[in-house]
């Protein structure tokens, strides 16, 4: 007959499971409940995946692993008294008088409920890693945390290699016994202990539950340490960098923590499991019943099979681990779950030229000398596309790519960004906005939707801001409709006339050169270099200024670089930036200073791309530790990450203009990194690659 095999992880749990099985059988509950003995929750998950068991109750972290690695799904959730439905909230609490925010936690003193506890450790640490605030090298989360905070009390961390830092704030009991114990001997243990650590001034931030402050202030706590505490003297840290009142935990928290849930294989009927357990809880959850599902007292333990605080079990409607965990908790788990045993010893970097091979070799040696993990290996390829193929085939792991290549890497090869380059704020040549500039003209004003028949100025054929993005955007928006993939003809027919300088003018529509002027002698008209006065971004703007064209597609800085006295050439010397406007995608016009809100797309920074199964936090963790040593172009550590001058090349491995490698944060897909507008423009162009 049909039966459900529950997986127990210990002898007491097996004992309780046997009793539950008997109780269910005696009550005539179907199907039969059997008990299988596993050695741990992980082992049980493996047994379920291997069809040797069917069900187990797991906490959030284990649900994440079981779902991600083994395809298990949650089907029945626990609900707790005093909690918010099937969840509670992990919050970061600070004293109102302090100036700490989520963005300034580095170096502050921290109070935790205990090592590996959900709200005291897993959520805050996972969140800080996932959001890029805390970098972890080689999966050594403990080291990362001990380096990040300026001392902590993490009860239970006394047996680790980093106890000096992680137990620095712990104080033990009144006689100094049990310092840093993961037990009530340590006065700063558990929710109330971590809050006490903050309240007594030992720490600056406490990672606790949404209800902790309110349960331990305003006269609600019996111990003397809390009797004078007022809830209004504390605030919560919000993820957006703001702070909020302690009652605002629904809006201001680190993550909603999901309740424990029963997980099964994807092919198991979740409804059947709920019906079985529901019948059980109907009969066996009240005081004094011969078997009690939600009590473990009789077995000398806590939380066997189900949490003892469970008030009822409920069916889960959307049976996916992602839906049950919720995106906040899911993201935190992504940041936390890093298995050192699964971490590959090497990160194989893709290199494209002899100079790049040389620089990569030096980088590998420099990293190894500093014991950075994982070690770098250099693997060569013929082209960026070849790199993508080799990464997808698991022959290589990482490569730094430009915007268009990131698009191909993501769309065609399924790669994802692991880290990005960051350039100086004033550096507009590496990450910039593409804008459509027009003369301020109240009598003949037109919008982006009214470009047909206008005269256009472009930096050159194939230039990102001068051609690819504006043409792609106009195709994507349906204004330009190429026939038989002939983009050139379509553009030449869309605009009345243009200047689009080009290197190889064979079969080039004449109207695309109609506005070009060549050099001072009228020669070299429409050539793809500076002999054509309307070539490049400066030239395209000049084409507009001199009234050859009605619109110029340029970078957001082009107007500023050539007005208000910034360019002394005769054509530009008298220009004022306020005489020009931008055309916005929403049909409006805007001041040229409004480029961040009024642009066709932002050209994204380069990014390091990897396979989706690569742990991006270990890649960033490596680069972040490396740039502390080698990121400064003037460092004395024997290698310069962001400089290629020693190798007679430029932009090797990373762009030379890079100031820092940065985490991707929430931009975890190629589309997220590139931005919707840029992707749309590239899709417009790529739709024409027949």
């Amino acid at each position: 007959g049909m039966e459900v095999r529950w997986c127990a992880t210990s002898d007491p749990e097996q004992h309780k499971c046997g009793n539950m099985s008997e109780a269910f059988r005696e009550a005539g509950i179907q199907p039969s409940l059997l008990c299988v003995r596993g050695t741990s929750a992980d082992h049980c998950v493996q047994l379920i995946a291997a069809q040797e068991a069917d069900a187990i109750t797991l906490d959030g972290g284990a649900i994440y692993e079981a779902g991600k690695e083994h395809g298990l799904k949650p089907v029945v959730g626990e609900v707790y008294d005093q909690e918010v439905g099937t969840s509670y909230y992990a919050v970061a609490v600070v004293r109102r008088s302090s100036h700490v925010t989520i963005d300034t936690l580095k170096g502050v003193k921290s109070c935790h409920t205990g090592i590996n506890r959900t709200v005291g450790w897993n959520v805050p640490v996972g969140y800080l890693v996932e959001s890029g605030r805390l970098s972890v090298m080689g999966c050594d989360v403990l080291k990362a945390v001990s380096d990040y905070f300026g001392g902590s009390c993490v009860p239970g961390a006394g047996e680790t290699s980093y106890s000096e830092s992680l137990c620095r704030l712990c104080r033990g009991d009144s006689s100094g016994e049990g310092v840093c114990d993961k037990s009530p001997l340590e006065r700063y243990y558990d929710y109330s202990g971590a809050f006490r650590c903050l309240a007594e001034g030992a720490g600056d931030v406490a990672f606790v539950k949404h209800s902790t402050v309110l349960e331990n202030t305003d006269g609600k706590t019996l111990p003397s340490w809390g009797q004078a505490l007022l809830s209004q003297d504390f605030e919560l840290l919000c993820r957006d960098g703001s702070r909020a009142d302690v009652t605002e935990w629904r809006q201001c928290h680190l993550a909603r923590v999901p309740a424990h849930a029963v997980v099964v294989r994807a092919d198991t009927d979740g409804g059947l499991i709920f019906r079985l357990l529901n019948e059980g809880q109907r009969l066996f959850s009240h005081e004094g019943s011969s078997f009690q599902m939600f009590s473990s007292e009789a077995y000398g333990q806590k939380d066997l099979l189900f949490k003892d605080s469970t008030s009822e079990l409920v069916p889960i409607a959307t049976q996916t681990y992602e839906a049950w965990l919720g995106h906040e908790y899911l993201h935190a788990m992504k940041g936390l779950l890093c298995d050192p045993n699964r971490l590959p010893p090497y990160l194989r970097w893709c290199v494209l030229s002899t100079p790049e091979i040389q620089k990569c070799g030096d980088m590998a040696v420099a990293f190894r000398r500093q014991r950075l993990k994982p070690e770098i290996q250099c693997v060569s390829a013929k082209s960026p596309q070849h790199c993508m193929e080799r990464i997808q085939a698991e022959q290589v792991d990482a490569v730094t790519l430009s915007g268009e290549d990131i698009y191909t890497a993501g769309k065609t090869y399924g790669l994802v960004p692991a880290a990005g380059e960051h350039y100086a704020p004033e550096d507009s040549s590496n990450s910039y906005y593409v804008v459509a500039v027009v003369r301020r003209d109240s009598s003949h004003a037109f919008t982006l939707d009214e470009l047909r028949g206008k005269r256009s100025c472009h930096a050159g054929f194939g230039s990102p801001a001068g051609w690819d993005v504006p043409v792609g955007a106009l195709i994507q928006r349906g204004f330009i409709r190429p026939k038989d993939c002939d983009v050139l003809t379509a553009v030449s027919e869309f605009f009345n006339a243009s200047c689009v300088p080009v290197n190889n003018p064979k079969n080039y529509p004449s109207s695309l050169c109609a506005l070009c002027v060549g050099d001072e002698q009228g020669r070299n008209k429409c050539v793809g270099n500076s002999q054509e006065r309307y070539y490049g971004y400066r030239g395209a703007f000049r084409c507009l200024v001199e009234n050859a064209g009605d619109v110029a597609f340029v970078r957001h800085t082009t107007v500023f670089d050539n007005t208000n006295g910034h360019n002394s050439e005769p054509w530009a010397a008298e220009l004022r930036s306020e005489d020009y406007e931008l055309l916005c995608p929403n049909g409006a016009r805007a001041e040229v200073s409004q480029f961040a809100a009024c642009n066709l797309a932002q050209i994204p920074p380069h990014a390091v791309m990897v396979r989706p199964d690569t742990n991006i936090f270990t890649v960033y963790g490596l680069l972040d530790k490396a740039q502390d040593l080698f990121g400064d172009d003037h460092n004395k550590n024997g290698f310069k990450m962001f400089d290629s001058s020693n190798y007679h090349g430029q932009d090797l491995l990373f762009k030379d203009a890079t100031v820092r490698a940065v985490p991707v944060g929430e931009k975890t897909t190629y589309r997220g990194w590139l931005g919707l507008d840029y992707v749309a423009a590239l899709e417009g162009m790529s739709s024409q690659q027949c």
Epitope: N19, E22, E26, A27, S32, L283, S289, S290
Partner: antibody
Framework: EVQLQESGPSLVKPSQTLSLTCSVT????????WNWIRKFPGNKLEYMGY???????YYNPSLKSRISITRDTSKNQYYLQLNSVTAEDTATYYC?????????????WGQGTSVTVSS | DFVMTQTPLSLPVSLGDQASISCRAS???????????LHWYLQKPGQSPKLLIY???NRFSGVPDRFSGSGSGTDFTLKISRVEAEDLGVYFC?????????FGGGTKLEIK
Amino acid sequence: EVQLQESGPSLVKPSQTLSLTCSVTGDSITSGYWNWIRKFPGNKLEYMGYISDSGITYYNPSLKSRISITRDTSKNQYYLQLNSVTAEDTATYYCARRTLATYYAMDYWGQGTSVTVSS
Amino acid sequence: DFVMTQTPLSLPVSLGDQASISCRASQSLVHSNGNTYLHWYLQKPGQSPKLLIYRVSNRFSGVPDRFSGSGSGTDFTLKISRVEAEDLGVYFCSQSTHVPPTFGGGTKLEIK
């Protein structure tokens, strides 16, 4: 120690209702299963039914249309009613407890009460 | 219902002898959970039945270790290693694997 004691009339007329009480001491009837069993002359034992700690009842299908088991938790008593009795219902009636501790075997029985159905 | 057949009907023994009572079920008593719910009771003269053995071989508290149960599937045995005077009475086997629980016809242990 757990003790169960049956009580009720020893003589019931045919077609009438047999009503018995089981009084429990040393345990609460809100824990476990509380049963009725009868033993016919000639040693044959028949399981009649139970009322559980959560108030759920089970009746032997052979008696289903005639039997009712109820309880009064405030008195720690439970009851048997058997309708439309005939001479075939003449037997010694026992109440007994079943708990998880012995995998729901009947670990404690009452002394039994003898009931004769006769006009 | 599941029929339980006990043999012998009557078992005359001398004090100090070993006694063996057999119980056979009309179908297997192995539950789908792997357990076998076969129990033994003793009813002494003028008393109510008392539990001796539950789930084939587990002695109930206070039951002397001269009582032992064994068997599997459909065939089960109760053994008394050295019969004492207080062991006399009617022995019943009972199954609760299947619903409703049923009893054997009883075996009367008496002095030769």
